[in-house]
């Protein structure tokens, strides 16, 4: 798998999308996990609804949300109030039994808020020692959900 880079601004929301073959992964729940080291395990952050038919319902774990368009074949992860420590390597996964197939490897980069003049020295970027060959960069611009805004699924 190639690695897709998603860049977001500190303090804002970042939306990560993972497209997949909707028939190949029919009936399978999905998950978002964080890679612990280059060869380490992928630690589950959040997974879609326990009932696959309700995968369109957004599920949260802390500041991370997941929702799955099972017909269109797009898994969407929202990282709210992005922080420097959110930067790193993640995976979108398709679950079957106790196993997981990787749908996409994702490198999250956190950019300094241009309106925030505090020291940006602690913001994370991949160092030269870390190689992500053939990485594809996607700039994601998103907004935070307004207070009280309920993320209903599309009706059509």
């Amino acid at each position: 798998h190639n690695t897709t880079v998603f860049q977001g601004v500190a303090g804002q929301s970042l939306q990560v999308s993972c497209p997949y073959d909707s028939m190949k992964h029919w009936g399978r729940r999905k998950a978002w996990c964080r890679q612990l080291g280059e060869k380490g395990p992928c630690q589950r952050v959040v997974s879609t609804h326990n009932l696959w038919l309700l995968s369109f319902l957004r599920r949260w774990n802390g500041s991370t949300a997941i929702t799955d368009d099972t017909l269109g074949g797009t898994l969407t992860i929202t990282l709210r109030n992005l922080q420097p420590h959110d930067a790193g390597l993640y995976q979108c996964q398709s679950l079957h039994g106790s196993e997981a197939d990787t749908l996409r490897k994702v490198l999250v980069e956190v950019l300094a808020d241009p309106l925030d003049h505090r020291d940006a020295g602690d913001l994370w970027f991949p160092g030269e020692s870390e190689s992500f060959e053939d990485a594809h960069v996607e700039h994601s611009i998103s907004r935070s959900l307004l207070e009280g805004e309920i993320p209903f699924p599309p009706t059509s």
Partner: antibody
């Protein structure tokens, strides 16, 4: 009606090559994984591997990896199991089966089976 | 690989009897288990999936239970057509593995 129709019985000599087939009908062939299962005479069932005809993604059992090749031609809704050099120990009944994912539990089960292809390898 | 062990390997029973076959996994497989019936010279047939869900068209006298490592297939009242060999299979992980089979014979 979902149907998997396998090719006929084969008698081969050790060292010969062979390709058996499994044709699916009555459903969208490219939307389901197809598995192959071996049953040696008087024995149990052994899962060999599986293929997703939509993109030919394939998984093998470690016991069969390198021993057989699983392929598919989606244009004719057919999956294949092949050997490049048969051994006497390959004598068995071979079944293809559709793997259907059950959305209740996100795993898949063999819900439709071919009638089996008997392969006999003898000098 | 996950090992699946069935017991007994064979059982003799009469029409109308209640029969229970057990299957044990070498490690926890949640409820990712199937039961199949196979008659001589025929392909296996799916009876139960997800440990306890009855496949469409299968008579209600068949039922499955269990989770984790221990599972059972129960036939509440044996019919003549039920005499066959039964296999369990784990759908937890690759490689998929089957039990060695339980042959159900007429007493």
């Amino acid at each position: 009606e979902v149907q998997l129709v396998q090719s006929g019985a084969e008698v081969k000599k050790p060292g010969e090559s062979l390709k058996i087939s499994c044709k699916g009908s009555g459903y969208s062939f490219t939307s389901y994984w197809i598995g192959w299962v071996r049953q040696m005479p008087g024995k149990g069932l052994e899962w060999m591997g599986t293929i997703y005809p939509g993109d030919s993604d394939t998984r093998y059992s470690p016991s069969f990896q390198g021993q057989v090749t699983i392929s598919a031609d989606k244009s004719i809704s057919t999956a294949y199991l092949q050997w490049s050099s048969l051994k006497a120990s390959d004598t068995a009944m071979y079944f293809c089966a559709r793997q259907r994912t059950m959305y209740y539990d996100s795993s898949d089960y063999f819900d439709a089976w071919g009638q089996g292809t008997l392969v006999t390898v003898s000098s | 690989d996950i090992q699946m062990t069935q017991s007994p390997s064979s059982v003799s029973a009469s029409v109308g009897d209640r029969v229970t076959i057990t299957c044990r996994a070498s490690q926890g497989i949640s409820s990712w288990l199937a039961w199949y019936q196979q008659k001589p010279g025929k392909a296996p047939k799916l009876l139960i999936y997800a440990a306890s869900s009855l496949q469409r068209g299968v008579p209600s006298r068949f039922s499955g239970s269990g989770s984790g490592t221990d599972f059972t297939l129960t036939i509440s009242s044996l019919q003549p057509e039920d005499f066959a060999t039964y296999f369990c299979q784990q759908a937890d992980s690759y490689p998929r593995t089957f039990g060695q089979g339980t042959k159900l014979e007429i007493k």
